[in-house]
Interface confidence: medium
């Protein structure tokens, strides 16, 4: 969805895209409350067995301008000695999110939601062992 | 982020932040294309050593109007034996999303952005063990 | 494949009444909300009314609020908009479309039907 300011220096636009009489303004609210803005950040990534790491994934025509995105440390599942397990595999899980990007080349102040799909995190999972026929 | 319409019923923003007053295109991009849409549920909330359920979220006023919401199964997590271990943990990896939500209904035409918090999936750590001063 | 086709359109002396139709295919009708959509000459696109997947709730427009009427027939797979007390700035082509939450898109529109109210 592009959200465009109503603006005399950006043209109007006729498409069938846009309604007239819907209009946002960007504040944006926590439906939870204190519940999401003040979580400490979680240390699961690394006292996971499925490890992972963060990487920052910024953009400042976006928001959230900052994304952290998980990718799996290893390929296989840390077990209790500290060892990889060859018949586990750590996989990451990834969930579609909704991000707000500005379009710079149109007109100033010119967004859209886009889906992006991200890592959140890594588990551990028995691997799928192929029979042979 | 509210969506405000153009009508006397509903608020009139006339403040000077014109981020506040801007029009909305109807169409929602993929910024990885058919990689979102196309993507099969993966299997791994059965096949993990810390499983999960999912249990639909509906609402229609919002946007999305499903979100499917991951819950542990176990508190503890499964070992190569299908058994719990109980000196490890299932926990809870969870994300903050945006979604677009309906204003009450008296302003049907007027939407918000909103944080929500939801869980994805769940991974297995070590217990932490508290040693006795 | 989804459908949506209107009907009902047409030439109207202010003050007169229009019933449009939309008959919609290709898709489980009863689990989506429908829209009213139109779109005046030269004019951007309005959002008129919508109703919710069992009929119980209704959203309109000020502009058109008592004058318009939403209404579905899940078993018909039909949506219908009555028109009364015209008046000439609700001449445009009339929409229907099936979506989520309206703001972010229509997963589908008809043709549009022209509604003209003219003395």
């Known amino acids: 969805a592009a959200i465009i300011p109503q603006s005399s220096a950006c043209p109007n636009t006729e498409a069938k895209d846009f309604l007239q009489n819907v209009k946002v303004n960007l504040k944006v609210f926590n439906s939870l409350g204190a519940k999401v803005s003040s979580r400490r950040p979680s240390d699961y990534l690394n006292r996971s067995t499925s490890p992972w790491t963060l990487h920052r994934n910024e953009d400042p025509d976006r928001y959230p301008s900052v994304i952290w995105e998980a990718q799996c440390r290893h390929q296989r599942c840390v077990n209790a000695e500290g060892k990889l397990d060859h018949h586990m595999n750590s996989v990451l899980i990834q969930q579609e999110i909704l991000v707000l990007k500005r379009e710079p080349e149109s007109c100033p102040f010119t967004f859209r939601v886009e889906k992006m799909l991200v890592g959140v995190g890594c588990t551990c999972v028995a691997s799928i062992v192929r029979q042979a026929a | 982020a509210a969506i405000i319409p153009q009508s006397s019923a509903c608020p009139n923003t006339e403040a000077k932040d014109f981020l506040q007053n801007v029009k909305v295109n109807l169409k929602v991009f993929n910024s990885l294309g058919a990689k979102v849409s196309s993507r099969r549920p993966s299997d791994y909330l059965n096949r993990s050593t810390s499983p999960w359920t999912l249990h639909r979220n509906e609402d229609p006023d919002r946007y999305p109007s499903v979100i499917w919401e991951a819950q542990c199964r176990h508190q503890r997590c499964v070992n190569a034996e299908g058994k719990l271990d109980h000196h490890m943990n299932s926990v809870l990896i969870q994300q903050e999303i945006l979604v677009l939500k309906r204003e009450p209904e008296s302003c049907p035409f007027t939407f918000r952005v909103e944080k929500m918090l939801v869980g994805v999936g769940c991974t297995c750590v070590a217990s932490i063990v508290r040693q006795a001063a | 494949e989804v459908q949506l086709v209107e009907s009902g359109g047409g030439l109207v002396q202010p003050g007169g009444s229009l019933r449009l139709s939309c008959a919609a295919s290709?898709?489980?009708?009863?689990?989506?909300?429908m829209y009213w959509v139109r779109q005046a000459p030269g004019k951007g696109l309005e959002w008129v009314a919508e109703?919710?997947?069992?009929?119980?709730?209704?959203y309109y427009v000020d502009s058109v609020k008592g004058r318009f009427t939403i209404s579905r027939d899940n078993a018909k797979n039909s949506l219908y908009l009555q028109m009364n007390s015209l008046r000439a700035e609700d001449t445009a082509v009339y929409y229907c479309?099936?979506?989520?939450?309206?703001?972010?898109?229509?997963?589908?529109w008809g043709q549009g039907t022209l509604v003209t109210v003219s003395s």
């Open positions: 109703i919710k997947q069992d009929g119980s709730v209704q």
């Open positions: 479309a099936k979506g989520e939450i309206l703001p972010l898109y229509f997963d589908y």
């Open positions: 290709g898709f489980t009708f009863s689990s989506y909300s």
